[in-house]
Amino acid sequence: ASVGLPSVSLDLPRLSIQKDILTIKANTTLQITCRGQRDLDWLWPNNQSGSEQRVEVTECSDGLFCKTLTIPKVIGNDTGAYKCFYRETDLASVIYVYVQDYRSPFIASVSDQHGVVYITENKNKTVVIPCLGSISNLNVSLCARYPEKRFVPDGNRISWDSKKGFTIPSYMISYAGMVFCEAKINDESYQSIMYIVVVVGYRIYDVVLSPSHGIELSVGEKLVLNCTARTELNVGIDFNWEYPSSKHQHKKLVNRDLKTQSGSEMKKFLSTLTIDGITRSDQGLYTCAASSGLMTKKNSTFVRVHEKPFVAFGSGMESLVEATVGERVRIPAKYLGYPPPEIKWYKNGIPLESNHTIKAGHVLTIMEVSERDTGNYTVILTNPISKEKQSHVVSLVVYVPPQIGEKSLISPVDSYQYGTTQTLTCTVYAIPPPHHIHWYWQLEEECANEPSHAVSVTNPYPCEEWRSVEDFQGGNKIEVNKNQFALIEGKNKTVSTLVIQAANVSALYKCEAVNKVGRGERVISFHVTRGPEITLQPDMQPTEQESVSLWCTADRSTFENLTWYKLGPQPLPIHVGELPTPVCKNLDTLWKLNATMFSNSTNDILIMELKNASLQDQGDYVCLAQDRKTKKRHCVVRQLTVLERVAPTITGNLENQTTSIGESIEVSCTASGNPPPQIMWFKDNETLVEDSGIVLKDGNRNLTIRRVRKEDEGLYTCQACSVLGCAKVEAFFIIEGAQEKTNLEHHHHHH
């Protein structure tokens, strides 16, 4: 056989045996002569360097450029390719020689007691076990152990070739520790050398350092860094570390394989770097590299070494945090320190504990901030080693978008008697207070009769063309009073009032309040009627269990058929055009009520009495009257609110106090509740009676003791009582100093 590229000037070397394959018996002599046109050399199996003693290469006697290769007493191991080539070229002729040695059918590698086959666990990969044959047509099988398994050529992926060896898919023998080839000749078995199976993997999935970041120590402490490499199976790992003082005398490195669950397709290796008694020069970047040979991965972390433990606030620590009601507020404690400090949060001096609304940790988190969260928050950092403390105050300001107190769900609001003067009010609560409250108006019919507009609960009035109240052309004459500020329910509120000089036209009025975080609005339906008039007896909002009467008064000469109704829950959606007071057109939503009729000289009065009013009695009450001439129905609506009964409570504490003889004591006791409670004062459990020195004012809310004497010392109790019970607060008044004796002193006496 010829190998190499043909040359114009050179013919391939010519062999004396003109065959591709030569088969000879063992112990015979192999002799091949090679002739050519320039210097020739021979290469033969098992020894490519020409130092083999048994092989003789001699110059031919009969010509130039001719060499004869002779091997006396050939053995099976001489089987292989014999190549004659021109020096410094690729031009060569090759003959493959089989030395048939039935006692040794497999060719053994020189000095090999065993071989090694490297395989990867891959379904698509095949491996060749190089058990070459000295006979071309042997029946060869492959034996793997342990457990013992035999593989026979299948004409497909398993085969044996005398020049190449045994080919088999690598995964089939990946379990085995060793394999060998076996040939059967005349019922006799012959085995090749053993081949150790080495399954090689190489892929490293990742290298992870632990701790992975933020490593801080102080001088003298111990550093322990773990480096974990996760790899595919059958991988070996080399670890190496790089760090600032690699020559460290206190350094210790331990490498080990980690146990992984059986069935896992992953292996873990761990390298641990330990430095005892760390120094400042050990600060810096620590890198761990893991390498399988074909793949290297590394990971780094920075180790900071402090001279000593310390704690300080970071420059980004805020002093003022602004938020809007309902938002989530996060106030991080930004610090520098080693070791990490203990963090404690306080509000107005009281420690904060985490619960479902607040999380007090490295970050103070208020889930849904409310006004009551406004205040000063103090964060105290404590170094756990040195016990050094640092504190910082953060002011939290919670803003509230304008909320209009009278704003309620859609309901036809009260009707107003024609020609009367009326005051409309918007009470606005906002933080910061609204920078403006504007009033707008629109005629009722302009707003209610546009079928193109849909009405929703949130926007009951589909009005677009709002006009400023300064422009009251075609409407009611209006005057807007200057905003007033009032303390209502303990909150500073802004009250804006609009005075309608004469109620002539049905209209809608809107007040709009705006502050830095939002806006609020209220639409008031101002329905003017010439019809009946509703009054409340007594003329105040009733409390539960009190009685109240609703009086409907109508001119007897104009109206007839007075009837009381209660407005039931309205079906949604409400059709446009029925607003704002559609009750007369839609009697389906009304519940007829029992009432008593009275008359005087000019009017009929229909009285609907609610005995023991309950919260369920709240709602819109409609008085319906019919025009005697036109038979047109007129409706008047009155919204009734029933106040809930609330047991007395006293806001604010009476405080113990020390006063000198002759001075005055002034204390107040503010009680709330419904019905409003009665306030009484006691001294040493006896009722306190007013006299010249003891003054009770504002329904007993304020107590003044003038020119105190020693006998005024004692336990003072403020008690607020109603039918729902009592609440009380106590304080001890201490009187200091010597009593002056004087005949002029006319002081109060206690009973």
Partner: antibody, heavy 117, light 112 residues
Framework: EVQLVESGGGLVKPGGSLRLSCAAS????????MSWVRQAPGKRLEWVAS????????YYADSVKGRFTISRDNAKNTLYLQMNSLRAEDTAVYYC??????????WGHGTTLTVSS | DIVITQDELSLPVTFGESVSISCRSS???????????LNWFLQRPGQSPQLLIY???TRASGVSDRFSGSGSGTDFTLKISRVEAEDVGIYYC?????????FGSGTKLEIK
């Protein structure tokens, strides 16, 4: 600046031996896997051998297995390739390459080996 | 072994135009970790190879954003936009999904 400089190439007879060296500088040699890649005249690049950072694990192409040995001396920042039983088909330019994540991110300029009698 | 094929031996191109070099693998290079282990190298005339792209589409550090890699499990493309003089050379693709790592035969980018 990362530098890899190969040396030791030359002309050798078939069956002969040779040792290639690769001197590394500009990076921490002991933290990178190293490989040899060769390119025969007019042929594609062929991976030859690789070694782990500590030298414990080595891999070879089938074509050189049993004849070539890759090794490293981390103290000298040097990579070696001992080549025995050389054949004409081993003739090529031999590059040493630095490996990270399996990628050969830096290569030397190469040294030429010619196997010829 | 995985065979990497680069069909175009050479690609003549004009400065400033865009060019795509293709590469095919005999087996999917999408590994079970979801990454595609294909690299692109450039060997400029008389120089050693330089890593351009790894994991199919990630540019090596210092490589111009004019180079971009894309592909599926077996078919890959290296796109060079606005070709410059320094882009001339042989482009090799290489698989890293299975040992031994194999290279393509190379595609020579030359100026028309």
């Amino acid at each position: 600046e990362v530098q890899l400089v190969e040396s030791g190439g030359g002309l050798v007879k078939p069956g002969g031996s040779l040792r290639l060296s690769c001197a590394a500088s500009g990076f921490t040699f002991s933290m990178y896997g190293m490989s040899w890649v060769r390119q025969a005249p007019g042929k594609r690049l062929e991976w030859v051998a690789s070694i782990s950072i500590g030298g414990s694990y080595t891999y070879y192409a089938d074509s050189v297995k049993g004849r070539f040995t890759i090794s490293r001396d981390n103290a000298k920042n040097t990579l070696y390739l001992q080549m025995n039983s050389l054949r004409a088909e081993d003739t090529a330019v031999y590059y040493c390459a630095r490996e990270m994540d399996g990628n050969y991110d830096y290569w030397g300029h190469g040294t030429t080996l010619t196997v010829s009698s | 072994d995985i065979v990497i094929t680069q069909d175009e031996l050479s690609l003549p191109v004009t400065f400033g135009e865009s060019v795509s070099i293709s590469c095919r693998s005999s087996k999917s290079l999408l590994y079970k970790d979801g990454k595609t282990y294909l690299n692109w190298f450039l060997q400029r005339p008389g120089q050693s190879p330089q890593l351009l792209i790894y994991l199919m589409s990630t540019r090596a550090s210092g490589v111009s954003d004019r180079f971009s890699g894309s592909g599926s499990g077996t078919d890959f493309t290296l796109k060079i936009s606005r070709v410059e003089a320094e882009d001339v050379g042989i482009y090799y693709c290489q698989q890293l999904v299975e040992y031994p790592f194999t290279f393509g035969s190379g595609t020579k980018l030359e100026i028309k």
